[in-house]
């Protein structure tokens, strides 16, 4: 989960630590500590909605809550792209939009969110249990993917609340880049604190956050591999696979989204922030690239409330996405 920067409140230094050396040894650790605490990780949210007018028509919206620049978005269904999922659309911020039936209209809504209308396969909606996944490749974070589906009993015209899915995957490029620096900083911080442990440390005031505010945590490979063992399997019913249609796809068009209640206290991300709610929707999934799924909101045992990242087994090149897109 992405967390808002929580800058620790510092008490004045104790007498006797006021010298130049004292200042230098104090400032650096607290800057590093702030970095470690505030190191928010990106987040992808997914919203799936069945249109009231056409019961077999779906609209998927996805957004990326992160500071990096998005290099590619891939929307798939039936599971993550490349793990049995079928690509519905690929959106590149500068190179354009590609989509395949039953996708009818893919578009950028903002610089960090996209929407996709799917045309249904019949009068009724056999696709209500289909899982839709959005993968955002970004720099420097790497690739992040979240999946969602309609809640089983959703009424037409209503949508599952956007799923602020903690994404259990990131490419090595992003992890080694950002997390490596942070990890090094945190280790260095501990080293400094140990060196100066004979000195009384400034007291930290506990930051006031709401009960559901997620805590930041530094990434460690051991945590990731441990968590991987505990991700439960879930069966995904992808019985609905409309026949492939050869259609031309118009772009652009009106925005059909009414404002939802805003739960953006910890997501100061501009236009897309309203679409992120801390309450996971029933039927929405968090995906893991190796084919495992965890129900959103159910945390793997022993991993705590923080985010656990899984490096992409394909290595740094995996963030390139569809071929030729660098």
């Amino acid at each position: 989960m992405r967390t808002e920067a929580q800058v620790p409140a510092l008490q004045p230094p104790e007498p006797g630590l006021e010298g130049a050396m004292g200042h230098r040894t104090l400032v650096l650790p607290w800057v590093l500590l702030t970095l470690c605490v505030t190191a928010g990780t990106p987040e992808v949210w997914v919203q799936v909605r069945m249109e009231a007018t056409e019961l077999s028509s779906f609209t998927i919206r996805c957004g990326f809550l992160g500071s990096g620049s998005i290099s590619l978005v891939t929307v798939s269904w039936g599971g993550p792209n490349g793990a049995g999922g079928t690509t519905l659309a690929v959106l590149h911020p500068e190179r354009g939009i590609r989509q395949w039936a039953p996708a009818r209209q893919a578009r950028w809504e903002t610089q960090s969110s996209i929407s996709l209308i799917l045309e249904g396969s019949g009068a009724s909606s056999p696709c209500a249990n289909t899982t839709f996944c959005c993968k955002f490749a970004s720099f420097p974070e790497g690739s992040w993917e979240a999946c969602g589906s309609l809640p089983p009993s959703s009424d037409p015209g209503l949508s599952a609340p956007p799923t602020p899915a903690p994404i259990l995957r990131a490419d090595l490029a992003g992890i080694l880049g950002v997390s490596g620096v942070l990890l090094f900083g945190c280790v260095y911080l501990l080293h400094l604190l140990r060196r100066h442990k004979h000195r009384p440390a400034p007291r930290l005031q506990p930051s006031r956050t709401s009960p559901q505010a997620p805590r930041a945590r530094a990434w460690a490979p051991s945590q990731a591999s441990q968590a991987a063992l505990h991700v439960p399997y879930a069966t995904i019913n992808t019985s609905c696979r409309p026949a492939t249609l050869d259609t031309a796809h118009p772009h652009g068009g009106p925005s059909w989204w009414a404002s939802l209640p805003t739960h953006a206290a910890h997501r100061p991300q501009g236009p897309a922030a309203w679409a992120s709610t801390p309450i996971p929707a029933r039927g929405s999934f968090v995906s893991v690239e190796n084919g495992l799924y965890a129900q959103a909101g159910e945390r793997p045992p022993h991993t705590g409330p923080g985010l656990t990242l899984f490096p992409d087994p394909r290595g740094p090149r995996a963030m390139e996405g569809p071929l030729g897109v660098r």
């Epitope: 690509t87 690929v90 500068e94 578009r107 796809h249 772009h251 071929l323």
Partner: antibody, heavy 114, light 113 residues
């Protein structure tokens, strides 16, 4: 290094069909979304269609519907374009290219002549 | 379909000169959601497949010399070669990357005097 290797030149008779191949290498094949482009002699480029490799979803330029059929074979990392009911108008160089046209095959020259 | 119109159809310049070619689209190629123009430029040398030079109207593909510059927005776009080299002899195409079907301009043939 990404490579798209196309099949060799074809000389066919009017009314016949031909199947051109484009073998992709250098990455996972399911990352290849293939476009097909026609270039008539000394003329501009025309987009024929594209294909998504996971389940073969396609888009066609209306002009080439009924003329071209795009398929993929994931096991051999190869995309195919079949052209049918050939006429002299179909004589051209046909290129395959990746999703955003940043890698191209070397082209397949098709000559339709009796 | 979006029609792409290029001008001039050909031009002849001496090495070292600056050259500008134009591309106009029948519909806007600006994506309102992210304010990006979906237009690409390609260079095709004799006997070779096209090569991507510019995408997003102004972003150079990696490995493309910085003498190639793309500009423009909406329906009017320009490709500029700041100092033409002998190896730039080619046909240059613009392409609608905005919506299906993807359409190309008729090309501008660059000849070196």
């Amino acid at each position: 290094e990404v490579q798209l290797q196309q099949s060799g030149p074809e000389l066919v008779k009017p009314g016949a069909s031909v199947k051109i191949s484009c073998k992709a290498s250098g990455n996972t094949f399911t990352d290849y979304y293939i476009n097909w482009v026609k270039q008539s002699h000394g003329k501009s480029l025309e987009w024929i269609g594209d294909i998504e490799p996971n389940n073969g979803g396609t888009n066609y330029n209306q002009k080439f519907k009924g003329k071209a059929t795009l398929t993929v074979d994931k096991s051999s990392s190869t995309a195919y374009m079949e052209l049918r009911s050939l006429t002299s108008e179909d004589s051209a160089i046909y290129y395959c290219a990746t999703l955003y046209f940043d890698y191209w095959g070397q082209g397949t020259t098709l000559t339709v002549s009796s | 379909d979006i029609v792409m119109t290029q001008s001039p159809s050909s031009l002849s310049v001496s090495a070292g000169e600056k050259v500008t070619m134009s591309c106009k689209s029948s519909q806007s190629l600006l994506n309102s959601g992210n304010q990006k123009n979906y237009l690409a430029w390609y260079q095709q040398k004799p006997g070779q497949p096209p090569k991507l030079l510019i995408y997003g109207a102004s972003t150079r593909e990696s490995g493309v010399p910085d003498r190639f510059t793309g500009s423009g927005s909406g329906t009017d776009f320009t490709l500029t070669i700041s100092s033409v080299q002998a190896e730039d002899l080619a046909v240059y195409y613009c392409q609608n990357d905005h919506s299906y079907p993807f359409t190309f301009g008729s090309g501008t043939k660059l000849e070196i005097k």
